[in-house]
């Protein structure tokens, strides 16, 4: 029996099948079993990382350091690769065994935590065919997927999907916003066989839909029928001139007239001053510019609409989705701050298996970390307030000593002198 | 929106120099790349070389390689373009042109087109 | 290095659809944006990534790339659509326009 066969076995799932003309194509089939981890990446044997990751060869890139950062939830589990030098490009990788996901889920989880409140910066991970030469991985290096958050000044503060489909890099025509907080937080993208894709954040979906409708992948289902154009004699004025009208006989005043109430100054010369004119006022009986009143077009026919056609150079395609082949992992960006940690990555068919792991791995920690970056917080503003009260403690001081400088030289004489002295004058 | 404002014609004499200055307001300097295009009379339109100035790298066309250099200065929101050794076949208007960044990576102005330009700047190179 | 290829001039009737076109080997791959230039002004954006309108480009402008033509349609062209058109896309970070196409529109 041919493998689908013993796929489908049970009662009758083939007649099922046919009763219901349930279209399905053998690449699009795929059961369930064992989750498939193609990779899987913690940072959790110390230097270890350091043979699995390839450094692009050149001097001036950003090094990563391995690092749980300045606060975290758990201090070796939240070691993760942390880009270490301002104004750097970085380029590092890591291989796995090449697989292909026709027919089956792609999941890519990764955490990302920019605890350095990061101005301009990626956050991103793009997923490369294993033909990648890891040692030369730059910003024209073709990839398969890129996916994760970008933060570059005020304008963009994005989760970039980005899939290359027949050599183009294609983006996603919706907006959607990554974290920009300090703190860890876990993306998550799932590529399914039916042509669907989700984001998730944090565990919980943020967007998803269908691949043809929110990348321009295919080119348009309809366009404009090139062979019509708009007929002489449509008529898109919905009003026009009252015909019938027409500009009264008194309706052309000058707009300014001279001021009747004005006298010529008694101490005017005119051979000094030349010939008297009055001011100009505004002419209140001034209509303006005569408009005909405006009635409906009898000839209107509304805005005339291009007919659209059926696109000759449409043609669906069912494997958008997939790719044959994916080998590496890399991080390639741009970063104007440095301080960003990147963790807990996973490639898998698997959707739960992802969630799980998220919740795992970042699920248990993220409390922790904030736990201690308030801590944190609160006693750098303790600190703060303890400095402020100092430098306002020692200003008072300074203030004291200048007046005393300031004030004239008085005899020095004891209290106790003092006193005697208003005693007795008293 | 950003506006991009050029500074003006120049002649200059072969075998000199010139600097043309592209001063932008109204938007993010750092949210934008800066290109140069120049366009001789009667020419079509020419790529010299480009900028990201929160980067601070420019990347230049094979042709103008070691001839020009194009810098930015972000505390002015100027971009700046020198070209060096001029001859009279390089009489023509010079465009400044902005494209969204729309992400930290410096191909990022790729996907976008150069949305903005100036207003142009005749250079007229002749002894 | 990377050519891109237009026809030097396109006419057209007023209200007809225009088509320029513009060849390069897999152009599909690219990113494909068309800029109107007018004489004695800078060049305007009006199609980005093969066929999106910047803000404010009329509708009648749109764009398609496959294959190894890109091409911009101007549908129910008007007189005031009389200008030069180009090509431009991204090869290797390096910037590449075609060398243009100055649309007629007759009559």
């Known amino acids: 029996s041919s493998s689908l066969e013993v796929l489908f076995q049970g009662p009758g799932l083939n007649d099922i099948f046919e009763a219901q003309k349930i279209e399905w194509h053998e690449e699009n089939l795929y059961f369930q079993g064992e989750p498939a981890v193609y990779f899987k990446e913690q940072f959790l044997d110390g230097d270890g990382w350091t043979s699995r990751w390839i450094e692009k060869h050149k001097s001036d890139f950003g090094k990563f350091v391995l690092s749980s950062g300045k606060f975290y939830g758990d201090e070796e589990k939240d070691k993760g690769l942390q880009t270490s030098q301002d104004a750097r490009f970085y380029a590092l990788s890591a291989s796995f065994e090449p697989f292909s996901n026709k027919g089956q889920t792609l999941v890519v989880q990764f955490t990302v935590k920019h605890e350095q409140n990061i101005d301009c910066g990626g956050g991103y991970v793009k997923l490369f065919p294993n033909s990648l030469d890891q040692t030369d991985m730059h910003g024209d290096s073709e990839y398969n997927i890129m996916f994760g958050p970008d933060i570059c000044g005020p304008g963009t503060k994005k989760v970039h999907v980005i899939f290359n489909y027949k050599g183009k890099n294609v983006l996603i025509n919706k907006d959607i916003r990554c974290k920009d907080d300090e703190f860890t937080h876990l993306y998550t993208l799932i590529v399914r066989p039916d042509n669907t894709y989700e984001v998730k954040i944090d565990n919980s979906q943020v967007e998803s839909g269908s691949l043809e409708d929110d990348w321009d992948f295919l080119p348009p289902k309809k366009i404009k029928d090139p062979d019509a154009s708009k007929p002489e004699d449509w008529d898109e004025r919905a009003k026009i001139d009252d015909p019938t009208d027409s500009k009264p006989e008194d309706w052309d005043k000058p707009e300014h007239i001279p001021d009747p109430d004005a006298k010529k100054p008694e101490d005017w010369d005119e051979e000094m001053d030349g010939e008297w004119e009055p001011p100009v006022i505004q002419n209140p009986e001034y209509k303006g510019e005569w408009k005909p009143r405006q009635i409906d077009n009898p000839d209107y026919k509304g805005t005339w609409i291009h007919p659209e056609i059926d696109n000759p150079e449409y043609s669906p395609d069912p494997s958008i989705y997939a790719y044959d082949n994916f080998g590496v992992l890399g991080l390639d960006l741009w970063q104007v701050k440095s301080g960003t940690i990147f963790d807990n990555f996973l490639i898998t068919n698997d959707e739960a298996y992802a969630e799980e792991f998220g919740n795992e791995t970042w699920g248990v920690t993220k409390a922790a970390e904030k736990q201690m970056k308030d801590k944190q917080d609160e006693e750098q503003r303790t600190r703060r307030m303890m400095r402020t009260k100092m430098r306002m403690r020692r200003m008072r001081r300074t203030r004291r000593k200048m007046r005393r400088k300031m004030s004239p030289a008085r005899p020095r004489t004891s209290c106790r002198e003092a006193c005697l002295q208003g005693w007795t004058e008293a | 929106e950003v506006q991009l404002v050029q500074s003006g014609a120049e002649v200059k004499k072969p075998g000199a120099s010139v600097k043309v200055s592209c001063k932008a307001s109204g938007g993010t300097f750092s949210s934008y790349a800066i290109s140069w295009v120049r366009q001789a009379p009667g020419q079509g339109l020419e790529w010299m070389g480009g900028i990201i100035p929160i980067f601070g790298t420019a990347n230049y066309a094979q042709k103008f390689q070691g001839r020009v250099t194009i810098t930015a200065d972000e505390s002015t929101s100027t971009a700046y373009m020198e070209l060096s050794s001029l001859r009279s076949e390089d009489t023509a208007v010079y465009y400044c042109?902005?494209?969204?960044?729309?992400?930290?990576?410096?191909?990022?102005?790729?996907?976008?087109?150069?949305?903005?330009w100036g207003q142009g700047t005749t250079v007229t190179v002749s002894s | 290095s990377y050519e891109l290829t237009q026809p030097p001039s396109v006419s057209v009737a007023p209200g007809k659809t225009a088509r320029v076109t513009c060849g390069g080997n897999?152009?599909?791959?690219?990113?494909v944006h068309w800029y109107q230039q007018k004489p004695g002004q800078s060049p305007v954006l009006v199609i980005y990534?093969?066929?999106k309108r910047p803000s404010g480009i009329p509708e009648r402008f749109s764009g398609s790339n496959s294959g190894n033509t890109a091409t911009l349609t101007i549908s129910g062209t008007q007189a005031m659509d009389e200008a030069d058109y180009y090509c431009q896309a991204w090869d290797s970070s390096t910037v590449v326009f075609g060398g243009g196409t100055k649309l007629t529109v007759l009559g």
């Open positions: 897999n152009i599909r791959a690219k990113h």
């Open positions: 042109a902005s494209s969204p960044l729309r992400g930290s990576g410096w191909y990022w102005h790729y996907y976008y087109g150069m949305d903005v």
């Open positions: 990534q093969d066929s």
